[in-house]
Amino acid sequence: IWELEKDVYVVELDWHPDAPGEMVVLTCHTPEEDDITWTSAQSSEVLGSGKTLTIQVKEFGDAGQYTCHKGGKVLSRSLLLIHKKEDGIWSTDILKEQKESKNKIFLKCEAKNYSGRFTCWWLTAISTDLKFSVKSSRGFSDPQGVTCGAVTLSAERVRVDNRDYKKYTVECQEGSACPSAEESLPIEVVVDAIHKLKYENYTSSFFIRDIIKPDPPTNLQLKPLKNSRHVEVSWEYPDTWSTPHSYFSLTFCIQAQGKNNREKKDRLCVDKTSAKVVCHKDAKIRVQARDRYYSSSWSDWASVSCS
Amino acid sequence: RAVPEGSSPAWIQGQQLSQKLCTLVWSAHPPMGHVDLPREEGDGETTSDVPRIQCGDGCDPQGLKDNSQFCLQRIHQGLVFYEKLLGSDIFTGEPSLLPDGPVGQLHANLLGLRQLLQPEGHHWETEQTPSPSPSQPWQRLLLRLKILRSLQAFVAVAARVFAHGAATLSP
């Protein structure tokens, strides 16, 4: 058993029929010595008396809030949560696994630039009695500060396998980020999730360089070229990208896309912010960006219509 | 010093070589999405001791403008280190790699960039030298991946430095 926050305790349980329950001794935080009684949120009936109450936590029915009283006055409260371990693996019932690799990923994080600011998100099918808190640091053994804001429920609903999921996001900022340095310690993100009386935690470990995903290029424009089916397509670096661009350079890929998003032509990739391409009527030109020197994620596409 | 007295670094050549290095290091070990290579005790011997480009090394745009020598010396140290690693038993031992494959080309290009930074007769002190390599082929494979991932991060910073130097500091 360990303390998650003041008066909130997590009981780690081996979730197996043959496993014994966990013995928990609750102490009433009071100078009083006599006439102390205990009740639980489950029951107003007296569960015991004295300064301590020894309970067995084996099921969710044993978790919850335990309160000690004297003469009708509440002296202190202890909330017990359960963290299940099944076959040696901590439960992951609250969040939806995001199937995008061989590893089990529950938290996804992205950064728009090298400033040390990043956003993480996760999915859950649960809509009530849910609480999240996020902690982050650079490195584990000698952690350096990363500050995370409040967790927010996104307006976006994500549909996976014919089921709706809610998307939660959090933004974090490294305290003393150094955009030009080579990262040696990863950022660690820990999300504590509580659903009713179930506690779970989820972690993600990454270098900012690996989660970079630039915003799409901006100000995408077409300029017809005289006596030619070609056009000059030009764009700009996204406003959110790190500066100076001579140092934090992007590379761009351009693609012509036919009607109904069909017949995607070969991609043309350039380091400049313009290119000559063939532009058929009813087609679209789209451009995406990626860090020029490190193969992180491509941005989403920015597109412009040929007509 | 990085280059003979009185002459400025060959930023444009450095830009071309470092960008080529970026291409090669990613073809030697393509992006793998979310893959956590296990961090074991003893990793430290070869991948934690790499000379990384850190915040105080002057490799940021302002630091390069003030005095690019600090940064170039740091890049040089890294190049020497990785060059030795790529020439060591970790990469030459079993399972063997094609001599003209991406790792072989990478090794040659590291040498090219290092020589650009340190022409014959001009010597910088080099700090670390890689430790002995593991004996098991599977350990070697894992270590290769870790070294290449670390090199990807290193050459990205080096390429930014040369690109910025070429754009803003070359005569």
Partner: antibody
């Protein structure tokens, strides 16, 4: 006052099923797990299993697994225990009992339901 | 399954005399043991839980002790109404199991 009131005695043919009910009152029904105990004539007590009324989480005894089904209707504060493939060896009094939170014992018991199996 | 063994299987005590029943578990169960009393044709009634805690409303002539594998139920001064069968039950590991019962006769 805490009360667990069980349904009346049943007589069933071999191979049939029986469903015994247990209605809880005088306490918050959904927050206490409920269990079932069997007592054959002149014999001791046999723990059959327990279930959570809030989410129907169930722990069956291996001796009864496959033959017994526990269920609950929270709208009427009633728990059910269904025993299938009845045979003479299932003749017994079946008790429902309330599990004490923070412990695992039964602090209140129903009056019992006698199930007789006879052709 | 954990086997609970009670001794003796029956005892006869005069009113005002003490009585004691033992219960042994086939493996350690910490202090997760309960005692129940069952009178003829009635449902069992909880007496003691957590090896030594008295259930609310139970006379204090009843007491329990022990931990691990060996437990005892004591009745300080037996009264006529204490006649019945007494069962111990472990609730440490599923399936929770009962002892075979001890019949107490009050002479």
């Amino acid at each position: 006052e805490v009360q667990l009131v069980q349904s009346g005695a049943e007589v069933k043919k071999p191979g049939a099923s029986v469903k015994v009910s247990c209605k809880g009152s005088g306490y918050s029904f959904t927050t206490y797990w409920l269990g079932w105990v069997r007592q054959a004539p002149g014999a001791g007590l046999d723990w059959m299993g327990i279930m959570s009324p809030v989410d129907s989480d169930i722990r069956y005894s291996p001796s009864f697994q496959g033959q017994v089904t526990m269920s609950v209707d929270t709208s009427t504060s009633t728990a059910y225990m269904e025993l299938s493939s009845l045979r003479a060896g299932d003749i017994a009094v079946y008790y429902c009992a309330r599990r004490r939170p923070g412990q695992g014992y039964f602090d209140f018991w129903g009056q019992g339901t006698l199930v007789t199996v006879s052709s | 399954d954990i086997v609970m063994t009670q001794t003796p299987l029956s005892l006869s005590v005069s009113p005002g005399e003490p009585a004691s029943i033992s219960c042994r578990a086939s493996q350690g169960i910490s202090s997760w043991l309960a005692w129940y009393q069952q009178k003829a044709e009635k449902a069992p009634k909880s007496l003691i839980y957590a090896a030594s805690s008295l259930q609310s409303g139970v006379p204090d002539r009843f007491s329990g002790s022990g931990s691990g594998t060996d437990f005892t139920l004591r009745i300080g001064r037996v009264e006529a109404e204490d006649a019945g069968i007494y069962y111990c039950q472990q609730y440490n590991i599923y399936p929770y199991t009962f002892g075979q019962g001890t019949r107490l006769e009050v002479r």
